[in-house]
């Protein structure tokens, strides 16, 4: 038999890692292997998440907490709790429906994920371009043209209009 020292609802006595087993006179049964309950008083244990394929295990499941996944090398997490893995691209690229594509002129991406973003328009802040942008790096803005020595000039190309980057379905 199972003894508990509570006069209230017997299920409220069931701690994390157990569930209130209605099939067995509401005793607190331990969660079976590959399942967990993270809070007390639960009527069922949840099935542990399995990190398979492109997912790999970052934290093992236990009787009181779910497994946590991340992505295998060459992929990165997307969504709450790493619900998806998305392919990495190189810096200077973005992921499209057709795969990794170089950033268009006037845009950059300094990460292995995400979309190419327009270079900063230095002139909007009244500044000039100190270091030109590349596919991998944003421009570096410097002092305003008025602060430069006579004859010096700087041209900031306008950011081209472009469609937002795509992610795989």
């Amino acid at each position: 038999f199972e003894r508990t020292r509570s006069l209230q609802d017997p299920c409220s006595n069931c701690p994390a890692g157990t569930f209130c087993d209605n099939n067995r006179n509401q005793i607190c049964s331990p969660c079976p292997p590959n399942s967990f309950s993270s809070a007390g008083g639960q009527r069922t244990c949840d099935i542990c998440r399995q990190c398979k394929g492109v997912f790999r295990t970052r934290k093992e499941c236990s009787s009181t907490s779910n497994a946590e996944c991340d992505c295998t090398p060459g992929f990165h997490c997307l969504g709450a709790g790493c619900s998806m893995c998305e392919q990495d691209c190189k810096q200077g690229q973005e992921l499209t429906k057709k795969g990794c594509k170089d950033c268009c002129f006037g845009t950059f991406n300094d990460q292995k994920r995400g979309i190419c973003r327009p270079w900063t328009n230095c002139s909007l802040d009244g500044k000039s371009v100190l270091v030109n942008g590349t596919k991998e790096r944003d421009v570096v803005c410097g002092p305003s043209p008025a602060d430069l020595s006579p004859g010096a000039s700087s041209v900031t190309p306008p950011a081209p209009a472009r469609e937002p980057g795509h992610s795989p379905q």
Epitope: E2, P15, C28, S63, T64
Partner: antibody, heavy 122, light 109 residues
Framework: EVQLVESGGGLVQPGGSLRLSCAAS?????????PCWVRQAPGKGLEWIGC?????????YDANWTKGRFTISRDNSKNTVYLQMNSLRAEDTAVYYC?????????????WGQGTLVTVSS | DIQMTQSPSSLSASVGDRVTITCQAS??????LAWYQQKPGKAPKLLIY???TLASGVPSRFSGSGSGTDFTLTISSLQPEDFATYYC???????????FGTGTKVTVL
């Protein structure tokens, strides 16, 4: 080193009481590891006595035959579990094992102590 | 209460033999069954859990199967160190659910 060490066994008269201890080292009892007691009378099979939830709750799971004579308790600060045995009889003579019942091993006993002998005799 | 019945209670076999031990539960316990090996004067050793999963460090000649009420432990090719007593145990917690089987002693033929 991960181990369980029982102590407290010995000779006791019928009707007497005894408290066995089981000290865990190298791991802590938790919701994933329940301490349990199992006994084995001389020349006989294994007999499950009971287990206690490994976390902070005091839920115990006992074999029906214990009829309240045997009580399992735990001191988390000492990482030790106890078996209080009252109204002992000659048929309680056995080697008493402490075991760890592990969620990771399907609640099987994946770690056992060396056992402590309890002899009930006048 | 759950009762566990093992058969046979004893058997004699030779090195290299295939040995099968059965365990029957008095009610369904799904796959919540463990198998142990015990040698004289020693504590039991976990061989198999969840009816068919081999415990760490256990040789692959040991295997388990079954679900519900009927379970089997098989030793594919008996080795000298396998002569021992084997026990099944329900790991279906609560209501006297963790009972051991009656044991099977494997001796040299």
């Amino acid at each position: 080193e991960v181990q369980l060490v029982e102590s407290g066994g010995g000779l006791v008269q019928p009707g007497g009481s005894l408290r066995l201890s089981c000290a865990a080292s190298g791991f802590s009892f938790s919701a994933n590891y329940y301490p349990c007691w199992v006994r084995q009378a001389p020349g006989k099979g294994l007999e499950w006595i009971g287990c206690i939830y490994g976390g902070s709750s005091d839920i115990t799971y006992d074999a029906n035959w214990t009829k309240g004579r045997f009580t399992i308790s735990r001191d988390n600060s000492k990482n030790t579990v106890y078996l209080q045995m009252n109204s002992l009889r000659a048929e309680d003579t056995a080697v008493y094992y402490c075991a760890r019942s592990a969620w990771y091993s399907g609640w099987g006993g994946d770690l056992w102590g060396q056992g402590t002998l309890v002899t009930v005799s006048s | 209460d759950i009762q566990m019945t093992q058969s046979p209670s004893s058997l004699s076999a030779s090195v290299g033999d295939r040995v099968t031990i059965t365990c029957q539960a008095s009610q369904s316990i799904s796959n919540r069954l463990a198998w142990y090996q015990q040698k004289p004067g020693k504590a039991p050793k976990l061989l198999i859990y969840s009816a068919s999963t081999l415990a760490s460090g256990v040789p692959s000649r040991f295997s388990g199967s079954g679900s519900g009420t009927d379970f089997t432990l098989t030793i594919s090719s008996l080795q000298p160190e396998d002569f021992a007593t084997y026990y099944c145990q329900s790991t279906y917690y609560g209501n006297d659910g963790n009972a051991f089987g009656t044991g099977t002693k494997v001796t040299v033929l």
